[in-house]
């Protein structure tokens, strides 16, 4: 049940990331730690790196409000179940600073990719023999 709530939140975050991708030119072109090819059991640690990153609106044009609302939603902490398990893995997972830094466009693409991986793992874990390659 708790894991389901997490994954439902991940699915909603994909939509928010996709929305922000439409406004990449209105984001501060700062390089941010962007985990990629995250090792098994370090997904939650990588997720928290994405959430901690200082993604910012460039404060130009009419899109500032919608961008700031979306960034706020991205940073909202998921429900606290499984927090202990996440803490345990954080000890052995790479630190946020050790990940390659990327501009906002690639940062958002990698964030989306991690969210997709987590949802897919969750869906596959409920099903026997669904994964073919």
């Amino acid at each position: 049940q708790g894991q389901d709530r997490h994954m439902i939140r991940m699915r909603q975050l994909i939509d928010i990331v996709d929305q922000l991708k439409n406004y990449v030119n209105d984001l501060v072109p700062e390089f941010l730690p962007a985990p990629e090819d995250v090792e098994t059991n370090c997904e939650w640690s990588a997720f928290s790196c994405f959430q901690k990153a200082q993604l910012k609106s460039a404060n130009t044009g009419n899109n500032e409000r919608i961008i700031n609302v979306s960034i706020k939603k991205l940073k909202r902490k998921p429900p606290s179940t499984n927090a202990g398990r996440r803490q345990k893995h954080r000890l052995t997972c790479p630190s946020c600073d050790s990940y390659e830094k990327k501009p906002p466009k690639e940062f958002l693409e990698r964030f989306k990719s991690l969210l997709q991986k987590m949802i897919h793992q969750h869906l596959s874990s409920r099903t026997h023999g669904s994964e073919d390659s």
């Epitope: 439902i8 699915r11 909603q12 939509d15 997709q116 897919h120 869906l123 409920r126 073919d132 390659s133």
Partner: antibody, heavy 117, light 107 residues
Framework: QVQLQESGPGLVKPSETLSLTCTVS????????WGWIRQPPGKGLEWIGY???????NYNPSLKRRVTISVDTSRNQFSLKLSSVTAADTAVYYC???????????WGQGTLVTVSS | DIQMTQSPSSVSASVGDRVTITCRAS??????LAWYQHKPGKAPKLLIY???SLQSGVPSRFSGSGSGTDFTLTISSLQPEDFATYYC?????????FGGGTKVEIK
């Protein structure tokens, strides 16, 4: 706006292999999941399977032995092969994108494939 | 496989009517349910994902609710462009499965 377009033969003979291609425009195939869904005449929708941009696949167990989905990132296309077809495989075949893994946010208009000798 | 049962199979309604379509899963699927609108010869359109989240660009007259086994799609005030067939789809486990569809027709 992502657009998808199915292409391939509209008529396939029984026991042969059905081959369809989906061309993606307005977005890159090198992220997201890309799937196939079909609808036999007068029936509901049936998920065939999907492939991730990294190449991992999930297939409907009812079709698994006969299905192959592959992706060609250089052409921004993905394809479906269904072997040993019978009249029961006659359907409108749709390709679709799944950004959220669990649902399909962009679809092609569908292409009718008839299996008949 | 998880079976998805939609009711009614068809409904006649007028512009401005409130229309409710239900979808029942053969086992609990949490909130892993999507709703689609499909018009003949057109590409199906995602309306709702994870039971109640409105897909970007979809009018707010569409709403979804439910969790577990029973789900509802509501069109608060039917518009001329809403006459179509609606499908639910579960994503709790593979294989992904769809309901049989509900055709919304003009009264």
């Amino acid at each position: 706006q992502v657009q998808l377009q199915e292409s391939g033969p509209g008529l396939v003979k029984p026991s042969e292999t059905l081959s369809l291609t989906c061309t993606v425009s307005g977005g890159s195939i090198s992220s997201d999941f890309w799937g196939w869904i079909r609808q036999p005449p007068g029936k509901g929708l049936e998920w065939i399977g999907y492939i991730s941009s990294s190449g991992s696949t999930n297939y409907n167990p009812s079709l698994k032995r006969r299905v192959t989905i592959s992706v060609d990132t250089s052409r921004n296309q993905f394809s479906l092969k269904l072997s040993s077809v019978t009249a029961a495989d006659t359907a409108v075949y749709y390709c679709a994108r799944s950004a959220g893994v669990t649902d399909f946010d962009f679809w092609g208009q569908g292409t009718l494939v008839t299996v008949s000798s | 496989d998880i079976q998805m049962t939609q009711s009614p199979s068809s409904v006649s309604a007028s512009v401005g009517d409130r229309v409710t379509i239900t979808c029942r899963a053969s086992q609990g699927i949490s909130s892993w349910l999507a709703w689609y609108q499909h018009k003949p010869g057109k590409a199906p359109k995602l309306l709702i994902y994870v039971a109640s989240s409105l897909q970007s660009g979809v009018p707010s007259r569409f709403s979804g609710s439910g969790s577990g086994t029973d789900f509802t799609l509501t069109i608060s005030s039917l518009q001329p462009e809403d006459f179509a067939t609606y499908y639910c789809q579960q994503a709790n486990s593979f294989p992904l499965t769809f309901g049989g569809g509900t055709k919304v027709e003009i009264k």
